[in-house]
Interface confidence: low
Amino acid sequence: MGRARDAILDALENLSGDELKKFKMKLLTVQLREGYGRIPRGALLQMDAIDLTDKLVSYYLESYGLELTMTVLRDMGLQELAEQLQTTKEESGAVAAAASVPAQSTARTGHFVDQHRQALIARVTEVDGVLDALHGSVLTEGQYQAVRAETTSQDKMRKLFSFVPSWNLTCKDSLLQALKEIHPYLVMDLEQS
């Protein structure tokens, strides 16, 4: 876990400033798998290589993020960089969290996690335990560290929820399961509300 993210970052850091700009423009029009959302143009154009890598992984998760990066690089004629990513993909294998369930397809189904976002931000206190349960399966290393870096429980939960829009149903279920184990009474209370 995290290896694909590092490979994407290395590839993007190999781009010149103008190539990075072209990469972003192509990312705005590239054909996406059904159900996946597009990174908003305004935010996308303001990102450096690190920000963009994090956004690619949070929107598409590692496996599809890697694939998408390769597609765009090939489209730009940067075959060598794309080949380096292909090698990483073959070595690391597919990441389960980026499986066939589209990341954006469940956003409208009213999952517990979406319904109770504000309450969870306000009331979850044992965030590190939740993070450990999600680390490796749902959260990349970079995302895990980013949430851990926040100081208060509320800030940690806000940061965690910043990644939720790109999650599929499996990811949201994993968070719910972690909450049931760590904050069972809170979950029961919210389910009854």
């Epitope: 850091e13 400033g17 072209k22």
Partner: antibody, heavy 117, light 106 residues
């Protein structure tokens, strides 16, 4: 206030080496490429190379490979350029500049290197 | 590598006159950047990504172009615009600069 502070004037003997520094402040050093540019008196700008401090990745103009070595120290937010086997052709002002495409390029004040016997 | 050729090398213009500096590339360049430099000072970013004025640059300046042909235009020349202007491409390593255009006021 973002700043790049370059080291002072260098007077060097032919055949020797110098190491120029470029200290960053007021911005996150690791997310920018740091470029180095040469300008001889009365001449134009020549791009030497670029380093990404986070990864240590470097890119050089072929002309400066073997002449210049770019490094960076993340702990002190300082980029370095070592010039070796100096000749009079290396006498010039050397600029460091940070880049991030939507902000364009921001330059240090320059370091004058004079190579003389 | 991409070679950038600027023309003219030196030019002078009257106050109020329209000035155009061109930058021709040996290969297609996605975006061109322009720098202004006055004697004894560091270059300043003047126009970035072909047509965007850097902070503090007067609106009389503009940039345009695509592919191998790019230009910087001053709508009405003023004394403070006297300087050397350089184009730079960051589309492909190694990044390269044009040879510069020295603009003087008559």
């Amino acid at each position: 206030q973002a700043q790049l502070q370059q080291s002072g004037t260098e007077l060097a003997r032919p055949g020797s080496s110098v190491k120029l520094s470029c200290k960053a402040s007021g911005f996150t050093f690791t997310i920018y490429g740091i470029n180095w540019v040469k300008q001889r008196t009365g001449q134009g700008l020549e791009w030497i190379g670029e380093i990404y401090p986070r990864s240590g990745n470097t890119y050089y103009d072929e002309k400066f490979k073997g002449k210049a070595t770019l490094t960076a120290d993340k702990s002190t937010s300082t980029a370095y350029m070592e010039l070796r086997s100096l000749t009079s052709e290396d006498s010039a002002v050397y600029f460091c500049a940070r880049s991030r495409e939507w902000e364009g390029v921001f330059w240090g004040q320059g370091t004058l290197v004079t190579v003389s016997a | 590598q991409i070679v950038l050729t600027q023309s003219p090398a030196i030019m002078s213009a009257f106050p109020g006159e329209k000035v155009t500096i061109t930058c021709s590339a040996t290969s297609s360049v996605s975006y061109m950047h322009w720098f202004q430099q006055k004697p004894g000072t560091s270059p300043k970013l003047w126009i970035y990504s072909t047509s965007n004025l850097a902070s503090g640059v007067p609106a009389r300046f503009s940039g345009s172009g695509s592919g191998t042909s790019h230009s910087l235009t001053i709508n009405r020349m003023e004394a403070e615009d006297a300087a050397t202007y350089y184009c730079q491409q960051r589309s492909r390593y190694p990044f390269t600069f044009g040879s510069g255009t020295k603009l003087e006021i008559k």
